[in-house]
């Protein structure tokens, strides 16, 4: 038997992926466990093998279909179960009725690129990946810029309160190396959270023209 507190958290990427993390204090280390998804209105069901990510937590991705296919809607509820093998049978360790559009976490933005760079400013664009068309324009973004000698944690957050897939960074220092990241969040969903940060985009501002004030 397993004692201790259990936490089972899942997010839907809005298209065809549900990612889950299960943590259990005093959990069994060498036991095979899986997440099973059973939607209340659809014909498919799906399973993924939980793999350890730390001493007492496991994670897996339920792949529901092709990455850009819409596999769930706002009317769906998916019963998610953690099942662990006990001898010849499976034991239910955790269960939740999962409302996908109340528990959203999108994929990190992709295709970051410098559109235009000057001495003091830089225009950057990006794209969202595998995001449902249901959101229309109801998305927001956060961005951050890493300056020399600072950490990402120290970088101030810039908030874009609309679906705007570009930003113009101002008041930059000439001839300086920077890095930039962005993340996205739908406005919908009680338990919706920010996507992971994008891969950092490195860029360098142009040097100031010789003999001119900067």
């Amino acid at each position: 038997a397993v004692n201790g507190t259990s936490q089972f958290t899942c997010f839907y990427n809005s298209r065809a992926n549900i990612s889950c993390v299960w943590s259990q204090d005093g959990a069994l280390q060498d036991t095979s466990c899986q997440v099973h998804a059973w939607p209340d209105r659809r014909r498919w069901n799906q399973t993924c093998e939980l793999l350890p990510v730390s001493q007492a937590s496991w994670a897996c991705n339920l792949i529901l279909g092709a990455p850009d296919s819409q596999k769930l809607t706002t009317v769906d509820i998916v019963t998610l179960r953690v099942l662990c093998r006990e001898g010849v049978r499976w034991r239910v360790m955790a269960i939740q009725d999962f409302k996908p559009f109340e528990n959203l976490r999108l994929m990190a933005p992709i295709s970051l690129q410098v559109v235009h760079v000057e001495t003091h400013r830089c225009n950057i664009s990006w794209e969202i990946s595998q995001a449902s068309h249901y959101f229309e324009r109801h998305l927001e973004f956060e961005a951050r810029t890493l300056s020399p000698g600072h950490t990402w944690e120290e970088a101030p957050l810039l908030t874009l309160k609309q679906k705007q897939e570009w930003i113009c960074l101002e008041t930059l220092t000439p001839d300086t190396q920077y890095e930039f990241q962005v993340r996205v969040k739908p406005l919908q969903g009680e338990f919706t959270t920010w996507s992971p940060w994008s891969q950092p985009l490195a860029f360098r501002t142009k040097p100031a023209a010789l003999g001119k004030d900067t």
């Epitope: 209340d40 209105r41 659809r42 014909r43 498919w44 296919s69 819409q70 809607t73 706002t74 009317v75 449902s132 068309h133």
Partner: antibody, heavy 116, light 107 residues
Amino acid sequence: QVQLQQPGAELVKPGASVKMSCKASGYTFTSHWITWVKQRPGQGLEWIGDIYPGSGNTNYNEKFKSKATLTVDTSSSTAYMQLSSLTSEDSADYYCARERGGFDYWGQGTTLTVSS
Amino acid sequence: DIQMTQTTSSLSASLGDRVTINCRASQDISNFLNWYQQKPDGTLKLLIYYTSGLHSGVPSRFSGSGSGTDYSLTISNLEEEDIATYFCQQDNNHPYTFGSGTKLEIK
């Protein structure tokens, strides 16, 4: 095999109420939504609402919210739809169906006639 | 509400013909589109679910296709028993809605 049984006909007076039944067999009743659909003579299909027997959760078409009430009796694997304040506009065929990626099994339908 | 439009209300075809029935949604329904057959006696049957999934027991001459807002049901080799009215239906969002139906007759 999956079956949904509905009585063939109901005759009711205007202003009264009727409670029609849909008895399910051949599957786990509490695991699938039951939906109700209206069809006026020679007309198309209209979705009234649905109910999940496992929890009693319901969804209604706004148009039928004050007209229809959906319930279930899990002990007899039966879904019910009560229609209130009946008028001639409610005279129609009413179908129940099981939902599983579309309405995969249908009852034969109950013909409701509202007449004095 | 999502409107489902079947522009052809009736269709006449010969036995053995390939018949296509179209359905258009008022907005993108992400393939959450089903097709039903209603026989003259009122009996309703699911033919196709999620745009192209063939329901169990349905003959393989029935097929579905489409995406976004435009969908179609094809009967590849029309048989006598296919004489019926065909309805499309979206289960992308509540309230679920149906097309007005296409009545298929034999020439």
